[in-house]
């Protein structure tokens, strides 16, 4: 019952006389293990006997021993799942069916495997892709339906009988699905391989060729071209005729179209393999090639450079720069189309031949204004001398020359004056179009090259002008020598460096930052009155009366300048103290007596003290001594003392008389 058995093997095994076969085989039986295995050659079923008959190549006996003389056939399987067989060597008469009689505990089965043994080794098969095209890599496959562990073989590739250098990859398969040996070769066919024979040879272990397969390559390729010229010189003279032939050396498939190109541009109505140029002109010089196409694509031949020789044409001069800047380098180039190139040149400047100049180009390293003018040239080659062209103009430009500056006003110039300056030059190319002035200011330019400085500043010391075209040329700066009154006048206290105390020696300095002219006079002023005429004002012993608002003046022939006013403060101890009594110095008892301590001090008195006729300190510290109610016993002399941070001062005595009231007199 086939449903109980599952057996896998290749089906047919191929070999040749003297080789071997290896039959990969696996099985599975429903009830588990195999008990009996018999290998028949061409078995036939005897209906009467209900059993298979035929040559028994192998059977597993109960004791597990092989039948004698059957070492050639080996069962390499087991009783569970493997039924692999080996026959080594194999003979032609082994061809036919191998019958695998398999018996398990409850099931029986006969499996047939075809064995095909040829007399001689059969050839491998070369497999090619459907299309071979030049330079497109393909894989060539050589397949042999044979592989056996006991018999080593090799597959070798040859091209036109020569072993191919490319590395082939050989693989073998000995599986229940297939048995083969395969060689794969990666190959980029070239057009030259078209029609060539590729061979795959089968070699034995000794390298002997056993069999082979051959194929002819059909390599599709673009046309392969060569170009021929008659006459075979590619250098011709104007008016000659030339024929070019495009030879198609190979094309697969056949070519379909032909065209000719000159300098990469197709020539109209030229579609045959032959191109004839009658009476060539210089414009027909160039690189020619033919283009031929087939179904694979177009191909272009090598280029043929056709040179048409002619005498120089009318010349023109190319100047590297015009206008050229004075001092710069200028190159002159004579352009005169000719073939062959001109060998001698003649140069002209303003119609006169330039001596010693016979080259196509020459250089003037430092161009000068006199080099300006028209330059022309003549060129000659073996075919003649060309016409001299109209020439090219050289313009030499340069900055304004000899720039000077003139002060138009009469000198001397005083601060606040209006000054007019003019800027002059001797020559210029191109013409002067503007002027520049230094330093830059909000100044008026009433006309080109004239500058008007209104209300000129004291510090406008030097002015320079430039006349400008494309460049500016500066004149030497002109010193304006502006006269001005002294500037930066300040009072500086030299001594003392700290605050001024009465009796100090005091020195004041009158400083100024600048003056033009330098000769100056000094004046000191206090509260508007003139004090002295030196730069220093000295007080040997300053007194409070010297305090006040001081300023100094510095004058020169142009004018005078005053410093900021400074208040000189003299610090002194309280002085001129006196006691005053608002109600007079006679007071009736019971009334109020008010004594006031008056003083002159800087800084002001911050503390007062009062004393009586016995110099006894009174318990009062204010500026005012108030006795209320006053008594007759208060009669007597009083004085006060004032203190500031400089020192102390005291008043003279003042007498207070307190008289009895009418009531007191009445009681007595």
């Amino acid at each position: 019952d086939s449903s109980k058995w599952n057996i896998e093997h290749p089906g047919t095994i191929y070999a040749w006389e003297g080789a071997c076969v290896w039959v990969p085989c696996t099985y599975r039986v429903l009830d588990g293990a195999l008990e009996t295995f018999i290998l028949f050659h061409n078995p036939e079923y005897n209906q009467n006997m209900s059993k298979f008959e035929g040559t028994r190549l192998y059977e597993n006996t109960k004791d597990g021993k092989l039948p004698s003389g059957q070492k050639r056939v080996q069962f390499l399987g087991n009783k569970i799942n493997n039924c692999t067989l080996s026959i080594h060597p194999v003979h032609v008469n082994d061809s036919g069916q191998l019958g695998l009689r398999m018996v398990s505990k409850t099931e029986k089965w006969m499996e047939r495997i075809h064995l095909n043994v040829s007399e001689r080794p059969f050839p491998p098969r070369i497999q090619l892709p459907p299309k071979l095209q030049e330079s497109q890599e393909v894989t060539l496959t050589c397949l042999l339906n044979f592989s056996c562990y006991g018999y080593q073989i090799q597959l070798q590739w040859l091209l036109e009988g020569v072993p191919m250098r490319q590395a082939a990859v050989t693989s073998t398969s000995l599986s229940t699905k297939s048995v083969f040996t395969r060689s794969e070769l990666k190959f980029s066919p070239q057009w030259s391989h078209h029609g060539k024979i590729v061979t795959c040879e089968l070699h034995d272990v000794d390298g002997k060729v056993l069999s082979e397969d051959m194929v002819q390559l059909n390599v599709k390729h673009t046309p392969k071209l060569t170009i021929e010229v008659t006459p075979n010189e590619t250098t011709v003279r104007k008016g000659d005729s030339v024929t070019m032939t495009c030879k198609v050396n190979s094309s697969n498939p056949e070519y379909t179209t032909v065209s000719w190109l000159k300098d990469g541009i197709p020539l109209k109505e030229q579609n045959t393999l032959m191109l004839t140029l009658h009476k060539v002109t210089k414009s027909q010089s160039g690189r020619y090639c033919c283009r031929v196409s087939n179904d694979v694509g177009p191909a272009t031949s090598e280029k043929v450079f056709l040179q048409v020789q002619y005498a120089p044409e009318s010349s023109r001069v190319q100047i590297s720069q015009s206008p050229a800047v004075e001092g710069s380098e200028v190159n002159f180039l004579c352009i005169s189309p000719a073939n062959p190139l001109p060998t001698n040149y003649t140069w002209y400047h303003n119609g006169k031949e330039v001596q010693g100049r016979t080259e196509k180009q020459f250089q003037i390293q430092k161009i000068l204004p006199w080099h300006a003018g028209t330059y022309s040239c003549e060129a000659g080659n073996i075919l003649g001398i060309g016409e001299r062209g109209p020439g090219t103009e050289l313009d030499v430009q340069y900055p304004p020359k000899k720039v000077t500056m003139v002060i138009e006003n009469p000198t001397p110039i005083r601060e606040g004056d209006t000054v007019t300056l003019s800027c002059n030059y001797s020559s210029s190319n191109p013409i002067v179009n503007h002027y520049e002035w230094r330093p830059r200011g909000a100044w008026e330019e009433p006309s080109l090259g004239v500058l008007k400085i209104q209300n000129i500043g004291w510090n406008n010391t030097a002015v320079a002008c430039a006349a400008c075209n494309n460049w500016c040329s500066w004149a030497s700066p002109v010193t304006l020598n502006v006269l001005y009154a002294p500037r930066g006048v300040r009072v500086r206290k030299i001594k003392p460096l700290s605050e001024i105390h009465s009796g100090n020696s005091v020195s004041l300095q009158c400083d100024f930052s600048s003056s033009h002219p330098k000769e100056v006079q000094f004046f000191w002023e206090k509260n508007g009155s003139l004090l002295g005429k030196e730069s220093q004002l000295n007080f040997d012993s300053i007194s409070p009366e010297d305090a006040g608002s001081y300023s100094c003046w510095v004058n020169n022939s142009i004018g005078q300048t005053a410093s900021k006013a400074w208040t000189l403060e003299v610090l002194y101890a309280p002085r001129r103290l006196r006691v005053s009594m608002s109600q007079g110095n006679q007071v009736m008892e019971g009334k109020t007596a008010t004594l006031i301590c008056e003083s002159d001090a800087n800084p002001p008195v911050y503390s007062y003290a009062w004393f009586d006729w016995n110099n006894q300190s009174l318990p009062y510290s204010g500026r005012m001594l108030r006795l209320e109610p006053v008594k007759v016993q208060h009669s007597g002399a009083y004085w006060c003392q004032g203190t500031n941070r400089v020192g102390k001062g005291h008043s003279p005595l003042i007498t207070l008389t307190v008289y009895y009231s009418p009531q007191t007199i009445g009681r007595r």
């Epitope: 300040r490 500086r492 206290k493 030299i494 460096l497 700290s498 220093q536 006013a565």
Partner: antibody
Framework: EVQLVQSGAEVKKPGESLKISCKGS????????IAWVRQMPGKGLELMGI????????TYNPSFQGQVTISADKSISNAYLQWSSLKASDTAMYYC??????????????????WGLGTLVTVSS | EIVLTQSPGTLSLSPGERATLSCRAS???????LAWYQQKPGQAPRLLIY???SRATGIPDRFSGSGSGTDFTLTISRLEPEDFAVYYC?????????FGQGTKVEIK
């Protein structure tokens, strides 16, 4: 241009004497006070004293009184700072500076400007 | 003598930032008699401000001074690379004239 140019660096031994100078130019040297300022290595500025070249009146900072002598010669626009006996602790940079200033309103301002580039004095045994 | 105390001792800032330096006096400085100086390594000091708030000649307007009595401030509105230095305040209102110990402004 107002400028103060100081004498070059000095290397001395303890106990030796030294006199360094400061020359003024570009202004009336006699009418401006000159100050001497000490700066010990990596430290701040200390006013040592000031001199008025016009009459050589000198005021010392109490910390430096008796340690140094400040003098001036207005005829050659020079101010001087001198030591009679140097100590290692005198190692410092010494600057001279002009005392500028002006008075206006009720104030009189003073400042040090310009300064000399300094004289480095190194005292080491 | 009047003792001037500067703070902070070191100020770490980046270019473009604002710097505020303080100078405090032990007693009132009369008439705002206070100056500020800048000192770069290996150079002499340079006058920046006098009278607490007046800029010296040639000093850029990013430097400004303020204050009176005992508290004074130097402000650099936008630090430039060349402003990294040591800054000293100095009073000239009372003898002896004295300097602060300095504030170092360094690149952060």
């Amino acid at each position: 241009e107002v400028q103060l140019v100081q004498s070059g660096a000095e290397v001395k031994k303890p106990g030796e004497s030294l006199k360094i100078s400061c020359k003024g130019s570009g202004y009336n040297f006699a009418t401006y006070w000159i100050a001497w300022v000490r700066q010990m290595p990596g430290k701040g500025l200390e006013l040592m004293g000031i001199i008025y070249p016009g009459d050589s009146e000198t005021t010392y900072n109490p910390s430096f009184q008796g340690q140094v002598t400040i003098s001036a010669d207005k005829s050659i626009s020079n101010a001087y700072l001198q030591w009679s006996s140097l100590k290692a602790s005198d190692t410092a940079m010494y600057y001279c500076a002009r005392v500028g200033g002006y008075c206006s309103g009720t104030s009189c301002h003073n400042w040090f400007d310009p300064w000399g580039l300094g004289t480095l004095v190194t005292v080491s045994s | 003598e009047i003792v001037l105390t500067q703070s902070p001792g070191t100020l770490s800032l980046s270019p473009g930032e604002r710097a505020t330096l303080s100078c405090r006096a032990s007693q009132s400085v009369s008439s705002s008699y206070l100056a500020w100086y800048q000192q770069k390594p290996g150079q002499a000091p340079r006058l920046l401000i006098y009278g607490a708030s007046s800029r010296a000649t040639g000093i850029p307007d990013r430097f400004s001074g303020s204050g009176s009595g005992t508290d004074f401030t130097l402000t650099i509105s936008r630090l430039e690379p060349e402003d990294f230095a040591v800054y000293y305040c100095q009073q000239y209102g009372s003898s002896p004239w004295t300097f602060g110990q300095g504030t170092k402004v360094e690149i952060k």
